[in-house]
Interface confidence: low
């Protein structure tokens, strides 16, 4: 028996359902009574779901997994993982045994988009050219850790005097806070880009500092 999975990671958004695809080629006359199917975590060998002795043995993993029972006889051994969490990320191995056995691993990459950044300024009044200001860009509830980029109004990257911190909450999602310290020019626009490297998603925020009231 030959097991096939995608070698490209399955990307799943937090709180959505993901399908880890696994298939095999059944011989003519194959029946489910012959099938032993086991899904387990690749590294720890923890059992996730199994089908043995002609029946679905159910989820052994937080009751959030399911097979596709009507498709098993056609060789579809895929696993459905419901309400994906950050802690589900990792490699899963699909073992199929009929007479001989084969197995293959599929990786699950969990992702969550970052919110539109909010921009704050300190100090936020009586600003003059030459003043040192601190601009904070905050974006929330993303995964995995973000890449943060600052640019000025001409699109020139600002790399000096940037401090970025990322903190995970109880769900494993990251809040990112990036602080730019900059000396004000006569007028200036400062933009922050928060990129999710897995989703290739960019979230933008900017602040324009003029002689007039600030615009965000």
């Amino acid at each position: 028996v030959e097991v096939q999975v995608s070698e490209d990671p399955v990307v799943a958004l937090v709180d959505t359902d993901a399908t880890l695809r696994c298939s095999f080629s059944p011989e003519p006359g194959f029946s489910l009574a012959q099938l032993n199917l086991i899904w387990q975590l690749t590294d720890t060998k923890q059992l996730v779901h199994s089908f043995t002795e002609g029946r679905d043995q159910g989820s052994a993993y937080s009751n959030r997994t399911a097979l596709f029972p009507d498709l098993l006889v056609q060789g579809n051994a895929s696993l459905r993982l419901q309400r994906v969490r950050v802690t589900d990320e990792g490699s899963y191995t699909c073992f199929v045994s009929i007479q001989d056995f084969d197995s293959a691993a599929v990786s699950l990459q969990v992702a969550a988009p970052y919110s539109k950044p909010s921009m704050t300024l300190e100090p936020n009044k009586d600003l003059r050219p030459g003043n040192m200001v601190t601009i904070t860009c905050s974006s929330y509830q993303g995964y995995p850790e973000a890449e943060v980029f600052w640019k000025d109004g001409q699109g020139v990257p600002l790399t000096g005097n940037v401090t970025t911190s990322q903190m995970a909450n109880e769900r494993g999602l990251f809040d990112v806070h990036s602080v730019l310290r900059v000396v004000l020019g006569a007028n200036g626009t400062y933009s922050c880009l928060v990129r999710n490297p897995v989703l290739q998603q960019d979230a933008h925020g900017s602040v324009t500092i003029t002689g007039q009231p600030l615009t965000f």
């Epitope: 030959e2 097991v3 490209d8 191995t93 056995f101 197995s103 293959a104």
Partner: antibody
Framework: EVQLLESGGGLVQPGGSLRLSCAAS????????MSWVRQAPGKGLEWVSG????????YYADSVKGRFTISRDNSKNTLYLQMNSLRAEDTAVYYC?????????WGQGTLVTVSS | QSVLTQPPSASGTPGQRVTISCTGS????????VTWYQQLPGTAPKLLIY???HRPSGVPDRFSGSKSGTSASLAISGLRSEDEADYYC???????????FGGGTKLTVLG
Amino acid sequence: EVQLLESGGGLVQPGGSLRLSCAASGFTFSSYGMSWVRQAPGKGLEWVSGIYSGGSSKYYADSVKGRFTISRDNSKNTLYLQMNSLRAEDTAVYYCAKNRLRFDYWGQGTLVTVSS
Amino acid sequence: QSVLTQPPSASGTPGQRVTISCTGSSSNIGSNSVTWYQQLPGTAPKLLIYSDSHRPSGVPDRFSGSKSGTSASLAISGLRSEDEADYYCGTWDASLNAYVFGGGTKLTVLG
């Protein structure tokens, strides 16, 4: 840390045989397909062969079909390439690589020289 | 003659953006995802881009990949001297039942 270490290369006469080995560590070897890729001196990459995780299916480039045999021993975390009827054009650095369709880790390679 | 066609060479100066193309057919690029590999002088190849446009962790975001129809391309922005290397595209060919590489592109960083 994933590591792939090839061995078994050397100088062999045309028509001779060699067996290359690739010792794998740092990942669950038995769950991944594996491949051999070669590079002749000063030339580009050429895929040689690939094998499924359980060893049930094997694929070969036309240039080596019938002469080379890929195999694996999952109990030893080792991939093999048996090369028979070697020709001068088989001279190359042979790399083993993790996966069959997307080579995410490579060994440092072992040099095979076929010359009389 | 490689199944996938790449320009043999490309060049740029530090800070520039360089694009490397990879042209195939419906049986390879047209039906399977493309992977890009970087081979620095005297070293083994390294995975650079997978699934047409995804970067493994550790690969700078200056590297990006894209695919349209039966062609793929690798773009390198903000070119650096350490990017001087050979770049290969690769994918599975369903007709040949084999993995195929492009002939490779030697990238030179000038100046």
